[in-house]
Structure formats: structure tokens, C-alpha cells
Amino acid sequence: EQAPGTSPCSSGSSWSADLDKCMDCASCPARPHSDFCLGCAAAPPAHFRLLWP
């Protein structure tokens, strides 16, 4: 189980407590109710970061 305040997930993904694994934030615009999408809001996906180096 994932410890609070830590994230093993790579950029552009977020931890899902419902699935016990990292999930791609790219799915969140299509289905924002997913539990991991809250974590995506805190850090934009990697491809957005490339626009603002």
C-alpha cells in the first residue's frame, strides 16, 4: 500500500489507491472521477512541462 505523501510514479502519472499502481494522467480529462486524477492536478503531465522549460 502506498505511504501518504510519497509517490513512486513517473512524471505524467499518479498513484491509484483503487488499483495499487500508477495510472496515466492522460486519461483524466475523459474520466475525471478516477481516484488518481487528484494527484494529476498537482503536477502537470510531462508533455506540458516541455512547453515551459
Partner: antibody
Framework: EVQLLESGGGLVQPGGSLRLSCAAS????????MMWVRQAPGKGLEWVSY????????HYADSVKGRFTISRDNSKNTLYLQMNSLRAEDTAVYYC?????????????WGQGTLVTVSS | DIQMTQSPSSLSASVGDRVTITCRAS??????LNWYQQKPGKAPKLLIY???SLQSGVPSRFSGSGSGTDFTLTISSLQPEDFATYYC??????????FGQGTKVEIK
């Protein structure tokens, strides 16, 4: 072959308790989320509860929240549903089902169901 | 919760007929829509997931289409073993997933 086998159903009085079990075989149980779905006699399907692969995250339908508890024992490949304060409207066939490995997307395997009858 | 409404509630058809069942969501659910078949006294069986993807082992006469709020399950040529009740299920609004009320396909 994937198999899910429910047990523990039966006749219980209103206010009583039952514990359902679902024994899984034919696949590696621990990576999969699991669900309970029920079907009242002659009616449609109703999602009851969800549990994450580790058991650390659970969700319930409003109709059972506070009365039912879902759990799992990955070492025994078994899913459970503890049902307390049972009501007549809980009478149904209870199915366990395996969730997809993405996110709540589908139920790809189901057990044969166990009948719970709540009546005085 | 998102409401799923199937139509018709029941239908009569003959072997070889093309059968279409529709499912409407009370709000957009993108393509997060699945179809199940249930025969009397048996557990439901997954037919179609993500609106149009055929589950492994399901005959190709079954197909699904749609997105947003309107979805369709089509059986291109009804077979004797297809007489059953069919349910749609949305998995957009998690964890509050919901099923349609079912469509019973009977022999004419």
C-alpha cells in the same frame, strides 16, 4: 480456467448477519480488484462493493454503506462480504466478479452466485 | 448517480434476425460502456467493453457502438443461444457504477 465460487448465502432474519465468501482459482488473485454485485429476484443488476488488489481501498453503494464490509485474503485467494443489519430489500443473488486491470472498467469473470434471503 | 436507460425492455425475434438494443446515459460517459449477457439462473457474461471492443471468445455477430450518451448493441444474426437478457453498464462515474434495467430477447 478462471473460476469464482461464492458460498455463505442462506435464510436470515431481518437485522441478522451473514458472511459471504468467494474462492478464486485459475488466475493470480492478488493483482485484481474485486467486486460484489447483486440481483434481487426478477430484477436487474446492482453494484454493491469494490475492493482494491491490496485491500487498502474499498467502496460501497449507498444502499449498503455502514452495514456491509468487503475484505479479501490474498494468501487464501478469497474475497469476503460481511453483511450486517440485513433488511428484506437485501434479498438477492450475490455475485463476486473480477474487475479489469485498468480502472473500474468492466467485470470480466463472475461467480455463479449465492442466494441471500432476508425474511422473518 | 448516472442513470442508464435501455430500450426496449423486451423484444421478440426469430433466429437469423438482426437485433439492436439501445442504452442511453443520463449524461456523457465517453466510451465507458460495457454490455453483458445473462441467461436464466446463470451469471452475467461480458460481451463488449469500452463501447465497441469484443471480449475474447465472444462471437463476432455481437458488436457495440456509440459514445457520449447513446450506445447500441447489435446481434447481426440471432442464434438460438442468444435468447437472454442483456445489460449495459457505465464505468465513467466511479465508484458509483450503474447498470441498465435490462433487455430481454425472447423467441418470436
Amino acid at each position: 480456467e478462471v473460476q469464482l465460487l461464492e458460498s455463505g448465502g442462506g435464510l436470515v432474519q431481518p437485522g441478522g448477519s451473514l458472511r459471504l465468501s468467494c474462492a478464486a482459482s485459475g488466475f493470480t488473485f492478488s493483482p485484481y480488484p474485486m467486486m460484489w454485485v447483486r440481483q434481487a429476484p426478477g430484477k436487474g443488476l446492482e453494484w454493491v462493493s469494490y475492493i482494491s488488489p491490496s485491500g487498502g481501498s474499498t467502496h460501497y453503494a449507498d444502499s449498503v454503506k455502514g452495514r456491509f464490509t468487503i475484505s479479501r485474503d490474498n494468501s487464501k485467494n478469497t474475497l469476503y462480504l460481511q453483511m450486517n443489519s440485513l433488511r428484506a430489500e437485501d434479498t438477492a443473488v450475490y455475485y463476486c466478479a473480477r474487475g479489469g486491470d485498468t480502472y473500474f472498467d468492466y467485470f470480466d469473470y463472475w461467480g455463479q452466485g449465492t442466494l441471500v434471503t432476508v425474511s422473518s | 448517480d448516472i442513470q442508464m436507460t435501455q430500450s426496449p425492455s423486451s423484444l421478440s425475434a426469430s433466429v437469423g434476425d438482426r437485433v439492436t438494443i439501445t442504452c442511453r446515459a443520463s449524461q456523457s460517459i465517453s466510451s465507458y460502456l460495457n454490455w453483458y449477457q445473462q441467461k436464466p439462473g446463470k451469471a452475467p457474461k461480458l460481451l463488449i467493453y469500452a463501447a465497441s471492443s469484443l471480449q475474447s471468445g465472444v462471437p463476432s455477430r455481437f458488436s457495440g457502438s456509440g459514445s457520449g450518451t447513446d450506445f447500441t448493441l447489435t446481434i447481426s444474426s440471432l442464434q438460438p443461444e442468444d435468447f437472454a437478457t442483456y445489460y449495459c453498464q457505465q464505468s465513467y462515474s466511479t465508484p458509483g457504477i450503474t447498470f441498465g434495467q435490462g433487455t430481454k430477447v425472447e423467441i418470436k
